[in-house]
């Protein structure tokens, strides 16, 4: 007999997330209108495809990076998609509501569409440590909660700092691996005997986790340069993130079979190196000169990539209860820190060259943007660990971790799954 | 040569809208972000607004928020301000002005710096009853 | 916003004099400062962008300096075609440009 939600969720899980929507309907029907200025459509289907590679990143990307798991990559995929599908209304109000608001009703183009798929995304990243313990009503509260500080998080940024949108949007590496491994903190750790099977990663879900780190690794210089002001800064950060990348593969692959005694290349190390480079260079991917600059940095994260992929986990796994296969939260933890002090490193090297106190300045202001982002997403992030503990959610037990059969209905139940 | 000409400009009653064209030649226009600057009679420049190169990005000044809409037809070449809402504070000469992104860099980093290097010569916006 | 506060609002010269002009940024913008020269009827134009950097097309007489919140603008020998306005306009923070004053350079 195929397995069911219990009886409370099936009850609570449609009514909250029906609801929730019924609401944001609401809040567009009075608070919202669509952009009703002249653009010529051969633009607008340019920008608009900046957006689409945003999504197929959100969607495919991130969707199938975390379906790896043995017994859940349905739910992975799945899940991901509601989150993105929830999180990216909210994110739209939201950025409307703290950005336009005092002057009316909130105008939705295609940047703000753009502005949100980005928001989004940080969820898909910090969810990859909690995937497999948690349901979807947990999961709509954790979309929640975290769009809502990525959005003031980002809005005090650019108040206080003067940050432009591209700067103050990455960040959301450093945010989102922090946000998910305090919420990850919060859940509770041992996986019963019994179920240490089901976060094991088998071959076709690994070969999807893969298509996913494809999609990622393809699309990571339109993320990259998506918020970008000019055509020759969007030129440089694509250029860049792209070096970037190539050479973390290359390190990546080569790396893991450098970390295995036996020369073998882990699939886990992979799937999430190939991206080091991206996340490494996204803060500082237009002021970068020269392809080495960015292919040295390409390295090196692809090296800190593979060593925390081989050095982490045991650690992830004792304190947070991180599965082995989940790996991304710690990896942008680590990149996100990365490209944070690489642009601090430019502004210190600017203070040296210009002999200029003011510069000085500037390198602790960012200091403190990155302090902020870091402290926000850990206060954030057990907010919403201590909310997804309250029994009114009816989490999964520990003993259905990890286990598309508590979510999913199966025609035909074969246990091996 | 690259040019800017502006223009509907006119008198208008409070509360009414107008619409500023601005007609760009002589350069790539889908490649240059574009600003409507202002100055009322007898005061200094007033930033209005900016639109981005590919008119995904637009921002106001604090002043105009939720009255003025700035948009741009790169396939026509031309930059629109349409003012709602028209005040008596509104009366101003209304210029465009192209915006050059200066790119220079060093052996470790870029730099990026944007001005308004080319003008219009304005088109007059006057708010009377 | 950033406030640019200029200073003097209006000053008086005679020809081939050494004239400065001072903008003064209410936090840090580091160079992105740029000058205009505005003559009434005109349109503006743009004299030093970055702080420092001529325009080109610009005379060397004029000349740009300063970085973070202090910035001066310099006309080394004033020429009769200079008498005109100038203004400061910081381009730090793309959200909400500011132009400073202004300062109306007039004939003694």
């Known amino acids: 007999m195929s397995s069911k939600y219990p009886r409370s969720v099936r009850r609570c899980l449609p009514l909250w997330a029906l609801t929730l929507e019924a609401a944001l309907i609401l809040l567009f029907y009075f608070f919202t209108h669509y952009d009703a200025s002249l653009e010529d459509q051969k633009g607008l289907v340019a920008s608009y495809q900046v957006g689409q590679d945003l999504t197929v990143m959100a969607a495919i990307g991130l969707g199938f990076l975390t379906s790896s798991f043995r017994r859940h990559s349905w739910s992975s995929v799945a899940f991901n998609l509601f989150m993105l599908a929830l999180g990216v209304q909210w994110a739209i109000l939201l950025d409307g509501f703290l950005s336009q608001f005092p002057s009316g009703k909130v105008v939705i183009t295609l940047f703000s569409i753009r502005l949100a798929t980005m928001s989004a995304l940080s969820v898909l990243i910090s969810v990859d440590a909690v995937l497999g313990k948690v349901n979807l009503a947990q999961l709509v509260v954790m979309v929640l909660v975290e769009v809502t500080a990525l959005g003031n998080l980002r809005m005090v940024i650019s108040n206080i700092f003067n940050t432009d949108y591209h700067m103050n949007m990455m960040h959301i590496y450093v945010f989102a691996a922090y946000f998910g491994l305090s919420v990850a903190w919060c859940l509770p750790k041992p996986l019963p005997e019994g179920t240490e099977d089901k976060d094991q990663t088998a071959t076709i879900p690994s070969l999807s986790a893969m298509l996913g780190a494809l999609f990622l690794w393809m699309f990571w210089p339109s993320f990259n340069s998506a918020l970008l002001r000019s055509p020759i800064e969007r030129k440089n950060a694509v250029f860049n993130t792209y070096y970037a990348v190539a050479v973390s593969v290359v390190t990546a692959i080569s790396g893991s079979s450098l970390a295995h005694p036996q020369g073998k290349i882990s699939k886990t190390y992979v799937h999430s190196a190939v991206l080091a480079g991206g996340v490494a260079v996204g803060t500082s991917c237009h002021l970068i000169p020269s392809p080495w600059l960015a292919m040295v940095l390409g390295l090196v994260a692809g090296l800190i990539s593979v060593g925390g992929a081989k050095y982490l986990p045991g650690c992830c796994n004792r304190v947070l209860g991180i599965p082995h296969s989940s790996i991304m939260g710690y990896n942008f933890s680590l990149l996100g820190l990365l490209g944070e002090i690489i642009y601090i490193v430019l502004l210190v090297l600017d203070t040296v060259g210009a002999g200029n106190g003011m510069i000085g300045f500037q390198v602790l202001l960012s200091i403190g943007e990155l302090s902020l982002a870091i402290v926000i997403a850990l206060m954030s992030g057990l907010l919403t660990g201590l909310l997804l503990n309250l029994k009114i959610w009816k989490a999964p037990h520990e003993a259905k971790y990890f286990d598309d059969q508590v979510f999913w209905k199966f025609p035909h139940l074969a246990v091996g799954f | 040569q690259v040019q800017l000409v502006e223009s509907g400009g006119g008198v208008v009653q409070p509360g009414r809208s107008l619409r500023l064209s601005c007609a760009a030649s002589?350069?790539?226009?889908?490649?240059?972000?574009m600003h409507w600057v202002r100055q009322a009679p007898g005061k200094g420049l007033e930033w209005v607004a900016i639109?981005?190169?590919?008119?995904?990005?637009?921002y106001y000044a604090d002043s105009v928020k939720g009255r003025f809409t700035i948009s741009r037809d790169n396939s026509k070449n031309t930059l629109y301000l349409q003012i709602n809402s028209l005040r008596a504070e509104d009366t101003a000469v209304y210029y465009c002005?192209?915006?050059?992104?200066?790119?220079?860099?060093?052996?470790?980093?870029?730099?990026?710096?944007?001005?308004?290097?080319?003008w219009g010569q304005g088109t007059t916006v006057t708010v009377s009853s | 916003d950033i406030q640019m506060t200029q200073s003097p609002s209006s000053l008086s010269a005679s020809v081939g004099d050494r004239v400065t002009i001072t903008c003064r940024a209410s936090?840090?913008?580091?160079?992105?400062l740029n000058w205009y020269q505005k003559k009434p009827g005109k349109a503006p134009k743009l004299l030093i962008y970055?702080?420092?950097s001529l325009q080109s097309g610009v005379p060397s007489r004029f000349s740009g300096s300063g970085s973070g919140t202090d910035f001066t603008l310099t006309i080394s020998s004033l020429q009769p075609e200079d008498f005109a306005t100038y203004y400061c306009?910081?381009?730090?923070?793309?959200?909400?440009?500011?132009f400073g004053g202004g300062t109306k350079v007039e004939i003694k």
């Open positions: 306009q910081q381009s730090y923070r793309t959200q909400g440009l500011t």
């Open positions: 002589g350069f790539t226009f889908s490649s240059y972000g």
């Open positions: 639109i981005w190169f590919d008119g995904s990005n637009k």
């Open positions: 002005a192209k915006e050059h992104g200066y790119y220079s860099s060093s052996w470790y980093r870029n730099y990026y710096y944007y001005a308004m290097d080319v």
């Open positions: 936090q840090s913008i580091r160079r992105y």
């Open positions: 970055a702080a420092s």
